[in-house]
Interface confidence: medium
């Protein structure tokens, strides 16, 4: 039975040209995390695997940095970066946990961070 929950940074906003940290945290389970995938709609951004290490998708390598921890840092943001991001935790023996973050990239300086929320 999957008992864990994923806490994410929730709905967040950032300024065009700036950077943002996408962060998820898996709690309430003793399952071992074997891999974390970071995905954006129809693209893989990055993989962090215990054996492979970090792997950043080539189309993002110039503006995506691994970390902190299992998180991901997006740099040089554009309005096209607005959208859903998913952290997918592959665990043993529980299976897969997925967290969702919605990022809005704003033209002006009115960017504010949203509240954290949990996905069971």
């Amino acid at each position: 039975m999957m008992t864990g929950t994923i806490e994410t940074t929730g709905n967040i906003s950032a300024e065009k040209g700036g950077s943002i940290i996408l962060q998820c945290h898996l709690s309430s389970t003793t399952a071992q995390v074997t891999q974390v995938n970071w995905e954006q709609q129809d693209q893989l951004l990055a993989i962090c695997n215990a054996d492979l290490g970090w792997h950043i998708s080539p189309s993002f390598k110039d503006r995506v940095a691994p970390g902190p921890g299992l998180g991901l840092t997006l740099q040089s943001l554009t309005v096209n970066d607005t959208g859903e991001y998913f952290c997918i935790y592959h665990t043993y023996p529980d299976g897969t946990y997925t967290g969702r973050i919605f990022l809005e990239v704003l033209e002006s300086s009115v960017a504010e961070h949203g509240a954290r929320f949990q996905i069971p």
Partner: antibody, heavy 120, light 113 residues
Framework: QVQLQQSGTELVRPGTSVKVSCKAS????????IEWVKQRPGQGLEWIGV????????IYNEKFKGKVTLTADKSSSTAYMQLSSLTSDDSAVYFC?????????????WGQGTLVTVSA | DIVMTQSPSSLSVSAGEKVTMSCKSS????????????LAWYQQKPGQPPKLLIY???TRESGVPDRFTGSGSGTDFTLTIGSVQAEDLAVYYC?????????FGSGTKLEIK
Amino acid sequence: QVQLQQSGTELVRPGTSVKVSCKASGYAFTDYLIEWVKQRPGQGLEWIGVINPGSGGAIYNEKFKGKVTLTADKSSSTAYMQLSSLTSDDSAVYFCARYHYYGSGLFPYWGQGTLVTVSA
Amino acid sequence: DIVMTQSPSSLSVSAGEKVTMSCKSSQSLLNSGNQKNYLAWYQQKPGQPPKLLIYGASTRESGVPDRFTGSGSGTDFTLTIGSVQAEDLAVYYCQNYHSYPFTFGSGTKLEIK
């Protein structure tokens, strides 16, 4: 254009080892994962494992642990698969493949295959 | 490991006919969090390496003719060839890329009458 050039046919004795090479060209070698797939004559496809040429880290199908060692040489943009303690069950065509932009299990670029025949 | 079961193992059709083949997985390949199915279809012609046709259960790879259609979700998937051409003679494999090891089905061999 992207190419994966594999080494030629190998005829080897039981109990020995063989090292199959996969030379990549047309792209930045460390930007993509390399997967290896086995196909016995007239049979289906078996996923052997994957290597991250950037870190040297690898993931293996449990079935091939102890049998296969995956390595990569960044200086020559070449991935290697070593098979040890060869038996007739290891006689097969071995393919290397570069992963697709979206998922690390998707292979649109393949080597031509290397036939390994184990015979006394 | 996730077991992929394909049926039929072979089929023989005339050019112009519609063909469907099935792939079933022993575990769901659907990630309910992002609503994606981690299933791919490959075509392997004699003497050649496999070629990626479909990923995400239903998205055609660039350059793949639109007569190839993937459908299904969870554990049941289908590859349909709308109007078979002579060049479609091949073995078709489905593949799990939801979790390691990335297992393949045993294949469906398509023969042209």
